[in-house]
Amino acid sequence: EKAMVDGSWLDLAKRSKLEAQPFAHLTINATDIPSGSHKVSLSSWYHDRGWAKISNMTFSNGKLIVNQDGFYYLYANICFRHHETSGDLATEYLQLMVYVTKTSIKIPSSHTLMKGGSTKYWSGNSEFHFYSINVGGFFKLRSGEEISIEVSNPSLLDPDQDATYFGAFKVRDID
């Protein structure tokens, strides 16, 4: 009986530690995509609807804020698309990029952690164009550091929750 009690206590401890593990999955807020044809910061994301969830991290002012030191896996998926029903592309040569940036408040600095993308030729003769970028990596993050996303040509973003999103989850503590 004692062994059973110990076992269930261990399970509970494991479970509560897992539940305390920080994670976030943020999806694009399609009603508030900024305009611009150069690099712009995406500041409007959902954290609590549809696929979007957050736990033991903070989302504020368009940035994902780390609350616990640790090693985190960061990821971002950005889809760009254009259909002729929305009009024409003013230029057919496009640079479609995503930048995942870390900002430190304590020592004011900003670093690009990951970038991805390509130059594309989207011919006006085609009815539909689509391009997807996925980046991911393992990073040491400190409490208070902020993660943000920048993209080029935001007017071409696919606004669906399964298309444009980013997130993070803690993998382990810093020894």
Partner: antibody, heavy 126, light 103 residues
Amino acid sequence: QVQLVQSGAEVRKPGASVKVSCKASGYDFSNYAIHWVRQAPGQRLEWMGWINAGNGNTKFSQKFQGRITVTRDTAASTAYMELRSLRSEDTAVYYCARDTSNMVRGIIIAYYFDYWGQGTLVTVSS
Amino acid sequence: EIVMTQSPSSLSASVGDRVTITCRASQSISRYLNWYQLKPGKAPRLLIYGASSLQSGVPSRFSGSGSGAEFTLTISSLQPEDIATYYCQHTRAFGQGTKVEIK
């Protein structure tokens, strides 16, 4: 305020060419596209083509491909549409119109024509 | 190529009447539909863009609705200055126009 002022009426013989100008004022000419639209007597409005005033890129209706040239002079904030090999069916009022999309804010030419020129009547007759 | 079809081609109504013009696209165009007013000898005027957004400076008696392939322009209370031909438009395609007259 935003204004598009077009050149005056023209009469041409079949086979000739005509060049219509469209002078813009009241906004940054280079940040917008200019479209050309015409209306023949008793017909619907007909889109002909556009020019991105910033980079000079153009797109034309298949119907006019090979007969139409659209250019711009950014210093003079003026767009030009030249139509060649004129025939009697080209008799129409030709309009320039500004696309509402600001190219600084995005790269989609949206085909919302928020300001129009007063129109230029081109008559093709022998 | 998308074809826009308007109905009716002409209509006659009294001042103060509610007037409705319909525009159909040959395939779905989401909400990318605009309405213009054209008076003889004058520059066309954008009334409604994006199916239902009222262009700045346009009287509130004009309204637009619809999505997909069917759209309507409504004048809630027809005024003498509304005598004109109205065109729907999606990118490169215009409807054939609806001529509005006063009875």
